[in-house]
């Protein structure tokens, strides 16, 4: 009976032990598995991501570009109405320049004297800019960049005096350090009467004869609006 | 987002000088004016001047001109006020402030400067 | 310099009411002012900016308006926060300037 006993211990033991190791195998193939699984959800987590980051960016794209379009259609249909009218009320900007609270811009890429440059503008039905307000400072020092730029800023007849007439005294300035000077050094002949735009933006006169670059200004007639689109 | 860190409290001497300093972070430090603005005990706000951290191109108030310099390291995306000739009446908080659209949208915490013998 | 002055000085009032200050320039600053709140042993926050532009995460029930040389800032309906003191600032030319302030208390 003993004996009986022993070998039915053994064979327990042996099942016992195939059944362990079969589990351990299991457990190892599901161990496996999950790992494949886990890295084949992240992959699928990461091409999802990638999917969805290149979506929010072509989105955005295409309302950058839907913007655009309605803003070239505005303009478009506005520069129709304008040369379907008789030109006297401008209600949106000329093709390539650029419209900040109700003027229009135009930033030269050469070199005028300040007469040139101020004959230029008027030719166009504009004025060298006249700054009236920080804001408009800092517009326009945005688009000419670090680069000596007339404004319709002068001092030709005696006193410093803007070219549309807004009031110089009481206005906005933004002079350099000890500007204006009428400075004489120069060896050109005569003072400086003439106003720029300097590298950082902020004021100084010099010889009107300098082949700087310059912006014109136009302003948008207050009384008429905005045609509606097509 | 967007933040304006100042120096802590500093006490001088009439005819010292002072160095306030404001750390940004969270924009461009190079795109945007600075001002500074100061607050002396249960007055007003008074503007200094401004700086330009691009160009370093400042603009000061006349009443300041000649006692106040207005520095920056972009490197670290610190500006930096220096006020000489400190009089009792220069006790004050003073406050860095970015430029905004026709205001100041964020300010420092302030640094409170105290003048006394 | 251009002079800002703000009335009236000081203005008590209840939660729930509606409360109006003015500013007014010493002369035409187009629409380029803004509006501070200011509350004691802290920095001024913007409120307003260009007379009637509400800057982000302030509360709908602050509003501004005008332009030229007198504008208004209007608080639709007093909130226990919103009691402090209000800075308008013309950022037209320099040197910018600020108005004295308006202290707004409980009645």
């Known amino acids: 009976q003993n004996a009986q006993l022993q070998r039915e211990l053994r064979g327990l033991r042996e099942t016992l032990s195939n059944f362990t190791a079969s589990t351990e195998a299991q457990v190892k193939g599901l161990s496996t598995q999950g790992g494949n699984v886990g890295r084949k959800m992240k992959s699928l987590e990461s091409q999802l991501e990638k999917q969805q980051k290149d979506l929010s960016e072509d989105h955005s794209s295409l309302l950058l570009h839907v913007k655009q379009f309605v803003s070239d259609l505005r303009s478009l249909s506005c520069q129709m109405a304008a040369l379907q009218g008789n030109g006297s009320e401008r209600a949106c900007c000329p093709v390539n320049w650029v419209e900040h609270e109700r003027s229009c811009y135009w930033f030269s890429r050469s070199g005028k004297a300040w007469a040139d440059a101020d004959n230029y503008c008027r030719l166009e039905d504009a004025h060298l800019v006249v700054v009236t307000s920080w804001e408009e400072q800092k517009f326009v020092q945005h688009h000419i960049g670090p680069v000596n730029t007339w404004m319709g800023l002068h001092d030709q007849n005696g006193p410093w005096k803007w070219v549309d007439g807004t009031d110089y005294e009481t206005g906005f300035k933004n002079w350099r350090p000890e500007q204006p000077d009428d400075w004489y050094g120069h060896g050109l002949g005569g003072g400086e009467d003439c106003a720029h735009f300097t590298d950082d933006g902020r004021w100084n006169d010099d010889v009107c004869q300098r082949p700087y670059r310059w912006v014109c200004e136009t302003e948008l007639d207050k009384a008429s609006q905005e045609p509606p689109l097509l | 987002q967007v933040q304006l860190v100042q120096s802590g409290a500093e006490v001088k001497k009439p005819g010292a000088s002072v160095k306030v300093s404001c750390k940004a972070s969270g924009y461009t430090f190079t795109d945007y004016y600075l001002h500074w603005v100061r607050q002396a005990p249960g007055q007003g706000l008074e503007w200094m001047g401004w700086?330009?951290?691009?160009?370093?191109?400042?603009n000061y108030a006349q009443k300041f001109q000649g006692r106040v310099t207005m520095t920056r390291d972009t490197s670290i995306s610190t500006a930096y006020m220096g006020l000489s000739s400190l009089r009792s009446d220069d006790t004050a908080v003073y406050y860095c402030?970015?430029?905004?659209?026709?205001?100041?949208?964020?300010w420092g915490q302030g640094t409170l400067v105290t003048v006394s013998s | 310099d251009i002079q800002m002055t703000q009335s009236p000085s000081s203005v008590s009032a209840s939660v729930g009411d509606r409360v109006t200050i003015t500013c007014r320039a010493s002369?035409?600053?187009?629409?380029?002012l803004a509006w501070y709140q200011q509350k004691p042993g802290k920095a001024p926050k913007l409120l307003i900016y260009?007379?009637?532009s509400l800057q982000s995460g302030v509360p709908s029930r602050f509003s501004g308006s005008g332009s030229g040389t007198d504008f208004t800032l209007t608080i639709s309906s007093l909130q226990p926060e919103d009691f402090a003191i209000y800075y308008c600032q013309q950022a037209n030319s320099f040197p910018f300037t600020f108005g004295p302030g308006t202290k707004v208390d409980i009645k």
């Open positions: 260009g007379a009637s």
């Open positions: 002369q035409g600053i187009s629409r380029w």
């Open positions: 700086i330009h951290p691009n160009s370093g191109g400042t």
């Open positions: 402030a970015r430029d905004g659209t026709s205001s100041f949208d964020y």
